[in-house]
Each structure stands twice: as C-alpha cells, then as structure tokens.
C-alpha cells in the first residue's frame, strides 16, 4: 500500500541544491562603492533571480546559460543594504518553480560601523601578576579587531575573528592602564567602527 499517513517528501535536497550568493568586494562597504553580487548554481542554469526576502517582486533577473550570474549594484547607498537571496531555474522546470533560495547574504552599506563594547573578564580590577582578558564585542562576524592603550600610539594587539567579538590577553604586570578598541572590515575597501568607550584596568 502506498498511502502512508506521513506525507512523502521528494526529491532529496542534493537533487537540485540551493545556490551560493557572495559579494565583491565585500559584504560591508561604504556608500558609493560598486558592489557585485554573484549567484553560483551547482549546475548550469537558464535564469537567475536576485531578491530581498519579504519582497514579492524580484530585484533583478539574469538570463545566462551558465552556473554563474552577476548582479551589479552601482554606487550603493545605505538603502540598498539589507538581506539578499538568489534562486535559479531551468527551462524545463514547471512554471514558476525555482530552486530553493541561497542562504541570506547581509549587505551593509555604512560610513561607520557601530561602536563596540570593551569589557574585562573576569573584571577590571586584577590582582598583582594576574592576567586579564579584554573582550571587544561588535555586531558583525569576520572582522578585524584592534586594541589600543592610552599613551601608546601604535595598536597594542590585532585579532581577526569569525565571531562578532575578539578576546585580548593582557599579562598581569603590564595590565593596568586605560584601553579602547575598534574593529574594521578585514580587507579593502575598509570600513571602520567608532572607538569603544575606554576601560580602566587597575590593580587591587
């Protein structure tokens, strides 16, 4: 009997996998930069569509007989930031049937990234000789974090982090002082955050 109570699900996800969506030069850019969104299908497609989730109308179509479609956003404005997804379809698919959409790509167009926070772990008062960890926390993943110490011109430490934060370790004897941090996009065109509020580390 072929009438089970649970619905039959076909085909497996690997049958026509979702495409990949990426941005050049970066997903975080300053206004006025030309951005190219690249939608790559796992197989040659016939038509690609770029859209923003929640919007009925697609932003752009590309009719290309290949695995890659490029969507050009010229001199982007902050209003063009937001979530993007892409789909592909082939000419012999049913009317209106598209692939599953790509994962969301978040495009941020801004002059300056939000200010990070800087906190001490376990706290800003340390015992003599004890190490202290400073966490610089922003809102974006895959950023480069920079720690500064007041009175020292050059950055004290750099960290690239896949998380929206980075931890910096200060050796106990040199820990006391006034610190701040910021973060920036890891490659050009660089977008920088505001500096964090200062954090004072002192001995007990």
């Amino acid at each position: 009997d072929i009438t089970p109570s649970v619905a039959i699900i076909v085909p497996p996800a690997s049958y026509h996998p979702k495409p990949w969506l990426g941005a050049q030069p970066a997903t975080v850019v300053t206004p006025g930069v030309n951005v190219t969104l690249r939608c790559r299908a796992p197989q040659p497609a016939w038509r690609f569509g770029l859209f923003k989730p929640g919007e009925i109308a697609p932003l752009l179509f590309r009719d290309v007989s290949s695995e890659l479609a490029e969507f050009f956003l010229e001199e982007v404005t902050p209003a063009q930031g937001g979530s993007y997804r892409c789909c592909y379809r082939r000419p012999d698919w049913g009317p209106g049937v598209w692939s599953q959409p790509s994962d969301v790509l978040e495009l941020l167009v801004t002059e300056e990234l939000p200010r990070p926070s800087l906190v001490a772990l376990p706290g800003p008062v340390v015992g003599p000789g004890a190490n202290v960890s400073l966490r610089c926390a922003g809102r974006l993943r895959n950023m480069s974090f920079v720690l500064y110490r007041e009175g020292v011109a050059a950055p004290l430490q750099y960290r690239h982090s896949a998380q929206p934060w980075a931890d910096f370790t200060l050796l106990g004897a040199r820990a006391p002082g006034t610190y701040s941090c910021y973060y920036h996009t890891p490659s050009a065109p660089y977008v920088l955050s505001q500096r964090s509020e200062v954090l004072v580390i002192s001995w007990e």
């Epitope: 619905a7 039959i8 699900i9 076909v10 085909p11 049958y15 026509h16 569509g49 859209f51 989730p53 919007e55 009925i56 109308a57 697609p58 789909c87 082939r90 012999d92 698919w93 049913g94 009317p95 209106g96 049937v97 598209w98 692939s99 599953q100 959409p101």
Partner: antibody, heavy 117, light 109 residues
C-alpha cells in the same frame, strides 16, 4: 512532520465570495512554490493557481480575474480568495507544494466548497 | 476537455501488468517532465512518479514511469487489489500546470 491543512470551505451562494487557507508546517514555507488544485465531484484534477518563491502568481485561464492567490510567509499560510463564485466552482480544493523539476509532492487533505442557492 | 489525454478506464487481474497512457504535445510532455498520481477513493492524490521515471521513497518498484516523444506511460506490475484507484498524469507548459482526465483502474476478481 510535514503537514498541509486547508480550511475555509463551506456553502456559499452563487455570486458570493470565500477565502480558503492552507497552513503548512514542517517546511521553510517561503522557500517553495505553493499551489491550489481543485476536483469537482466525480471529476478529475484541475490546476487553479500557483504562488512562486518570488515574482507574479500564475493562474489557469478560467480563474484569472475571479480568484486571487496570496501567501503570508510569516504565518506559513497560503490563501485563495474566490470571488463571483458559480455553481461549477463546487469542488474539493487542495493545496499542494511543488517540487523540482515540476510535480506536486505534498498535498493537503482538501476542503469542500459548495456553491448553491 | 483535458489537454493531456488518458483512457478513462483500465483493468487487470491480480498479478498482471497494466499500462496507462498519457498523450500530450510538444509544448507540454514533449519538452517537459511528466508526473503520475494515485488517488484512492475519498483521499487526496499521492505522488507516484516524478521527473518521468523517478519514484518517491515509499513507492513500491512495481510502479514505473516512462516518456517517449509527446506521450508518457505508467506501468503497474504485479497488480494488487489495493492498486484500485484513479491515476492522473501531469505535466506543464510555459505558464500552466496540466492534468490528464484520469484513468480509473479496476482490479478484477
């Protein structure tokens, strides 16, 4: 578990209106094409309308102008607004999910619409 | 009148092989895929075959689909009493989804 549950059917007079709903669970609703198919008593299956991931909805010629399909991705729900109903619109209305390359792989249990005075 | 043409009825005895045909044109079956559905009395249709010849998980291999030119066919081998149902073919053109008129399969004896 994947489920489609239609509602909103019932008895309506000729010229009247009805709004059908199809609540989906077990799916990322927004990622798929959803459709309505109907079946008049003792007759075969007839495609009515479809709602793609994005872009304009498509309709069978007989229903363009009278019926409107819509979806609310936040509620995982598909709708069919039926206006100017006629006796010949009496049918069980099914919602279904379209798969690639072009088939309906998940069906609801259907909701009966009766148009009669 | 359906765009896809199926015989209104078919029959066979248990254990037999039965074939149901579906005829279309170059604008639908000829250039696109065909699916088949089984509908038992009082229930929703269930997908049997998609993409001309693929079976969803859970569908016995007694059911097979094929396509040639502008026609398609569903074959059921080793017929069983529970196969008695209506069977529909389905394809599409550039803007519409299309169903055949359906074939009522009777399992005799």
């Amino acid at each position: 578990e994947v489920q489609l549950l239609e509602s909103g059917g019932g008895l309506v007079q000729p010229g009247g209106s009805l709004r059908l709903s199809c609540a989906a669970s077990g799916f990322t609703f927004s990622d798929y094409y959803w459709t309505w198919v109907r079946q008049a008593p003792g007759k075969g299956l007839e495609w009515v309308s479809g709602s793609p991931v994005f872009g304009a909805a498509n309709y069978a010629q007989n229903f363009q102008g009278r019926f409107t399909i819509s979806r609310d991705n936040s509620k995982n729900t598909l709708y069919l607004q039926m206006n100017s109903l006629r006796a010949e619109d009496t049918a069980v209305y099914y919602c279904a999910k379209a798969g690639i390359p072009g088939h309906f792989d998940i069906w609801g249990q259907g909701t009966l619409v009766t148009v009669s005075s | 009148q359906s765009v896809l043409t199926q015989p209104p009825s078919a029959s066979g005895t248990p254990g037999q092989r039965v074939t149901i045909s579906c005829s279309g044109s170059s604008s639908n079956i000829g250039n696109n895929y065909v699916s088949w559905y089984q509908q038992l009395p009082g229930t929703a249709p269930k997908l049997l075959i998609y993409g001309n010849s693929n079976r969803p998980s859970g569908v016995p291999n007694r059911f097979s689909g094929s396509k040639s030119g502008t026609s398609a066919s569903l074959a059921i081998s080793g017929l069983r009493s529970e196969d008695e149902a209506d069977y529909y073919c389905q394809s599409y053109d550039s803007s519409s989804w299309l169903f055949g008129g359906g074939t009522k399969l009777t399992v005799l004896g």
